[in-house]
């Protein structure tokens, strides 16, 4: 709390300008009118205030707007945003995408902070859903944003927004998140032709069920190994050797290098060795010829 002291003669600020950098904390408190500061917030970011000086300016705005800042002030906070707490931000009502962009610009290159997370949460809740423009903006600043959301939060993403998602935005998503996103992507891209569809859907395939993988295997898609390794194990296991061969095309040779890793390892254990031998890759570990294959999935589920 800054002590209340009278402003020295001739030091009363007529406008927000660079002369204020020479003011001590108590002089800023005494000589800068909060209403003047609010109307000239756009000038603050051009002035090299220290964090301590920014604390004083924030204190003045807090006194002027105890219920939360208006959007006209929020849009021009600049580096002052770095001094806001999540509690401050929860009082705001940010509706303009331009305001969101301005504040994310200040945080460009920073790790996702509690302040930014709160700002985004307030903005998205205010909009009711994660629309395409918002998602475009957020993933441009934070490529990992989508994967930071819970499956429940992702369920509010409309399929139309999926067009804004880039492959790198899904890099850190786990299977539970892809389970939610995949059906939306399938819906969003449903009117595209085969090869174009595969290019778009590829990043989301970690959420694809077996039947969709079987369908893709009939379309000469030549899935790369990196994509195959991200598929759900339970979706890969029922695929036949012939289906995997068609799905991977020329990339099928890569299975040998991945034979000890999931899902390839588990898939090999489910295939007849005779069938694996037809690939000519030397894959070992399949079911020997003459053995009876029982489906234990029901038994596993019960135990």
């Amino acid at each position: 709390e800054v002590e209340k002291t009278a402003c020295p003669s001739g030091k009363k600020a007529r406008e927000i300008d660079e002369s204020l950098i020479f003011y001590k904390k108590w002089e800023l408190e005494a000589c800068v009118d909060a209403a003047l500061l609010a109307t000239q917030m756009d000038r603050v970011n051009a002035i090299p205030f220290t964090y301590e000086q920014l604390d004083v300016l924030k204190h003045k705005l807090d006194e002027l707007y105890p219920q939360g800042y208006p959007e006209s002030v929020i849009q021009h906070l600049g580096y002052l945003f770095l001094k806001m707490s999540p509690e401050d931000i929860r009082k705001w009502n940010v509706t303009s995408l331009e305001t969101l962009k301005a504040l994310l610009e200040v945080n460009k290159g920073h790790e996702m902070s509690p302040q930014v997370a709160t700002l985004i949460d307030r903005f998205v809740k205010g909009r009711g859903q994660l629309d395409k423009d918002t998602l475009d903006t957020l993933t441009a600043f934070y490529p990992g944003y989508l994967c930071s959301l819970s499956p429940e939060e992702l369920s509010s993403v409309p399929p139309s927004s999926i067009w804004a998602v880039r492959p790198q935005d899904l890099d850190t998503c786990d299977p539970r998140q892809l389970d939610v996103l995949y059906p939306k992507a399938r819906l969003a891209f449903q009117n595209m032709n085969g090869s174009e569809y595969f290019v778009k859907i590829q990043s989301f395939l970690g959420g694809a069920p077996t039947e969709d993988l079987k369908a893709l295997s009939q379309q000469n898609v030549s899935m790369d190994l990196a994509t195959f390794m991200k598929l759900r194990t339970d979706a890969v296991l029922p695929l036949t050797v012939a289906e995997v061969q068609k799905l991977l095309g020329p990339h099928v040779e890569g299975l040998k290098a991945e034979e000890r890793h999931r899902p390839v390892r588990d898939w090999i254990l489910r295939q007849r060795q005779d069938d694996l031998d037809t690939l000519g890759l030397g894959l070992q570990g399949g079911i020997p010829n003459g053995y009876l294959v029982l489906d234990l999935s029901m038994q596993e589920a019960l135990s």
Epitope: T50, E52, Q115
Partner: antibody, heavy 117, light 107 residues
Framework: QVQLVESGGGLVKPGGSLRLSCAAS????????MSWIRQAPGKCLEWFSY????????YYADSVKGRFTISRDNAKNSLYLQMNSLRAEDTAVYYC??????????WGQGTLVTVSS | DIQMTQSPSSVSASVGDRVTITCRAS??????LAWYQQKPGKAPKLLIS???RLQSGVPSRFSGSGSGTDFTLTISSLQPEDFAIYYC?????????FGCGTKVEIK
């Protein structure tokens, strides 16, 4: 008076890890943002990370992103830098500095990190 | 990233000389500029912030000026303890960046 003392430097092999510490005294540590800056032999100064007073706001330059982690313990008046996957180009004197926003007003004496096989 | 270019890279001068060092930013940084002095084996020491604000305890022979992209550090009358490397640094945008220094040597 304000004092910043770095420690933890030394010789490490490429791919190795090191943890630097910076002990602060003479000011209210929990009120201040803190930064790490480094200077490779005969090279320019490079600011590469900072952390806010509460620890909630963090920045990494691209040169260290994903490899270095900045943290602080306000109860111990200490700033830390965990450095993983070290490379030869990380060889430098590492300084911690008090960050006041428009400049760095106090610096430590530095600690030398040498990455070599 | 904003590039900071200092010139000259080194200057030879005598005690009592007036020395001027310039720093140019690759884009407008308003007055978000600081100057530091570094002596061999020592940490940099802040001289000037906000382009022209002299840090407490720094002799008045040091002065800074400029705004936008062009900045100047002036030592009005060089003293023996002033022989060192001088760096400029911008704080207008992240990442903060430094100039590569100007070495002030004895003539």
């Amino acid at each position: 008076q304000v004092q910043l003392v770095e420690s933890g430097g030394g010789l490490v092999k490429p791919g190795g890890s090191l943890r630097l510490s910076c002990a602060a005294s003479g000011f209210t540590f929990s009120d201040h943002y803190m930064s790490w800056i480094r200077q490779a032999p005969g090279k320019c100064l490079e600011w590469f990370s900072y952390i806010s007073s509460s620890g909630g706001i963090i920045y990494y330059a691209d040169s260290v992103k994903g490899r270095f982690t900045i943290s602080r313990d306000n109860a111990k008046n200490s700033l830390y830098l965990q450095m993983n996957s070290l490379r030869a180009e990380d060889t430098a004197v590492y300084y911690c500095a008090r960050d006041v926003g428009s400049h760095f007003d106090y610096w430590g004496q530095g600690t030398l990190v040498t990455v070599s096989s | 990233d904003i590039q900071m270019t200092q010139s000259p890279s080194s200057v030879s001068a005598s005690v009592g000389d007036r020395v001027t060092i310039t720093c140019r930013a690759s884009q407008d940084i308003s007055r978000w500029l600081a100057w530091y002095q570094q002596k061999p084996g020592k940490a940099p020491k802040l001289l000037i912030s906000a382009a022209s604000r002299l840090q407490s305890g720094v002799p008045s022979r040091f002065s800074g000026s400029g705004s936008g992209t062009d900045f100047t550090l002036t030592i009005s009358s060089l003293q023996p303890e002033d022989f060192a490397i001088y760096y400029c640094q911008q704080a207008k945008s992240f990442p903060r960046t430094f100039g590569c220094g100007t070495k002030v040597e004895i003539k």
